[in-house]
């Protein structure tokens, strides 16, 4: 074989270069034919009525032609012919890659509730070959299920992702990313999750600052409730008892002036929204007034589990006997 060609892969709309090379030339006519076996070039002359073909180089050892604005219909075998005895022929295959026309992401619900499973679909239309779709929630890759539909040598890929949402997912992007040989860099589309969740309630002691409650002192507790939608109702109650008469309620704040031992007990902040309700408890223990001048040594330890936060305050030498759990979130 005296005639050589190389296969060509080109992205739709770009330029393909076809080269016919002759090892030992005897000045025979070299001709390039299209997949319909019509002559594109006869040596350096183009008889074919398609001006997208242009001569790059012609010599006795090479015919090199460019094809601009390549379309899917240009795909196929191109033949180099050498008018020798016997005539020689070699073919090159042009493969046309088509990037996905459109990338669409569709979420089953605009707003989901924590714990709910939602369906997210991503469609990459009319590519060749078929597109690979990858899913990410933030930076975490997830596994979807893809279906491929073929029509006229083009592929439409739809990938389905079933996603159980959590409150932490609120505002996190769900990313549909395509991988395709005709696409350089990242081609992706994303939608931000909107997740509604029941309130998370935290009680913060804003006074006294050192955290030790003694007779005669004041106590101020602030209830922080975060949820989506933002909780409409934040209420304070005293568990198993009436609220002290000298307690003042002001929105999320509970203020008890002139503490005494009868105020001991559990104070609960309750918050609710359309998703549900939650509460956090504060256990008040009122200590005797101080008998010594030096300030007490205070150690604060916070222990967190997935469902409950326990705040333990060890206040002085008696705390070994009287140490109490002060705040519990539910």
């Amino acid at each position: 074989q005296n005639l050589f060609t190389k296969d060509v892969t080109v992205i739709e709309g770009e330029v393909a270069t076809i080269s016919c090379q002759v090892n030992k030339s005897d000045d025979s006519v070299i001709q390039l034919l299209n997949p319909n076996r019509q002559t594109i070039y006869f040596r350096d002359f183009r008889p074919l009525k398609d001006s997208r073909f242009q001569l790059l180089n012609f010599s006795s050892s090479e015919l090199k032609v460019s094809l601009t604005n390549v379309s899917i219909s240009d795909e196929g075998r191109y033949f180099c012919q050498l008018y020798t005895d016997p005539p020689q022929e070699s073919y090159t295959t042009i493969t046309v890659l088509v990037p996905p026309r459109n990338l669409m992401i569709d979420i089953q619900k605009d707003t989901a509730v924590e714990g709910e499973e939602i369906e997210v679909n991503c469609t990459a239309m009319a590519s060749k070959p078929a597109t690979t779709i990858r899913w990410f929630k933030g930076n975490t890759e997830l596994k979807g299920k893809s279906e491929v539909e073929e029509w006229s040598d083009m592929y439409t890929v739809t990938s389905q992702l079933m996603l159980k949402v959590h409150k932490e997912d609120d505002g996190v992007p769900v990313i549909c990313q395509v991988e395709h040989p005709a696409v350089t860099g990242n081609l992706q589309t994303q939608r931000y999750l909107e997740v509604q969740y029941k309130p998370q309630v935290h009680i913060q002691m804003t006074y006294p600052l050192q955290g030790l409650t003694r007779e005669g002192d004041a106590l101020e507790l602030t209830c922080e409730a975060i949820g989506k939608p933002q909780p409409v109702m934040v209420t304070w109650v005293r568990v198993d008892d009436e609220m002290p008469q000298h307690a003042v309620l002001s929105g999320p704040n509970l203020f008890i002036n002139n503490l005494n031992k009868t105020d001991n007990g559990t104070y609960r902040c309750e918050a609710s929204n359309i998703v549900g309700k939650a509460h956090s408890d504060y256990m008040l223990y009122v200590y005797d007034p101080p008998t010594t001048i030096p300030p007490p040594t205070t150690t604060t330890t916070t222990t967190t589990t997935t469902t409950t936060t326990i705040l333990t305050i060890i206040t002085d030498s008696r705390a070994g006997e009287e140490g109490s759990i002060r705040a519990v979130d539910h």
């Epitope: 005897d26 006519v29 076996r37 006869f42 183009r46 008889p47 005895d85 005539p87």
Partner: antibody
């Protein structure tokens, strides 16, 4: 001067033979495919035969296939047409022409 | 074998424009070439490819193709343009040649 000059035409009986020659000058003969085209008296042009630049490739019109043979001698810059089993309808002026897909150079013809 | 069809004769007033047409399926694929032949002379290439002219051919000669019809236009015909004009192409395989029957152009 770039030119083609045909010779070898003449009167021959039906069934007879004739060999036409075409001498090329002024260009690299071995580089070009060549053709024979004929024109019967008062008629249009009719393509007869083609040959590749090295001589290995040949094609014929259906009307002459099996009776005519095209050949070339690149060392002599000459194109030939061997015509056998001649018929009255082969009467024509025979032109040799240079092939670049189109025919850009013609001889004056031989009858 | 393909066939190319030409009108047998057309006439044109001196200095006017004449269009000679040639019909054939091959022109859907390939460009035509056109040859001028005066009495007693060999044919002469006047137009080829995508409206190209060999050197020495006046620019009043131009070629075009549309669908299966190739055309040769002489814009501002001169007395010396009176001749027979032949269209030529190859069949779709590119191996066999075919000529039109010729059009006799008379300049009045």
């Amino acid at each position: 001067e770039v030119q083609l000059l045909e010779s070898g035409g003449g009167l021959v009986q039906p069934g007879g033979s004739l060999r036409l020659s075409c001498a090329a000058s002024g260009f690299t003969f071995s580089f070009y495919p060549m053709q024979w085209v004929r024109q019967a008296p008062g008629k249009g042009l009719e393509w007869v035969s083609s040959i590749g630049s090295s001589g290995g490739y040949t094609k014929y019109a259906d009307s002459v296939k099996g009776r005519f043979t095209i050949s070339r001698d690149n060392s002599k810059n000459t194109l030939y047409l061997q015509m056998n089993s001649l018929r009255a309808e082969d009467t024509a002026v025979y032109y040799c022409t240079r092939d670049r897909w189109y025919f850009d150079l013609w001889g004056r013809g031989t009858l | 074998q393909s066939e190319l069809t030409q009108d047998p004769a057309v006439s044109v007033a001196l200095g006017h424009t004449v269009k000679i047409t040639c019909q054939g399926d091959t022109f859907r694929t390939y460009y035509a070439s056109w040859y001028q032949q005066k009495p007693g002379q060999a044919p002469l290439l006047v137009v080829y490819g995508e409206n190209k002219r060999p050197s020495g051919i006046p620019d009043r000669f131009s070629g075009s193709t549309s669908g299966n019809t190739a055309s040769l236009t002489i814009t501002g015909a001169q007395a010396e343009d009176e001749a027979d004009y032949y269209c030529h192409s190859r069949d779709n395989s590119g191996h066999l040649h075919v000529f039109g029957g010729g059009t006799k152009v008379t300049v009045l």
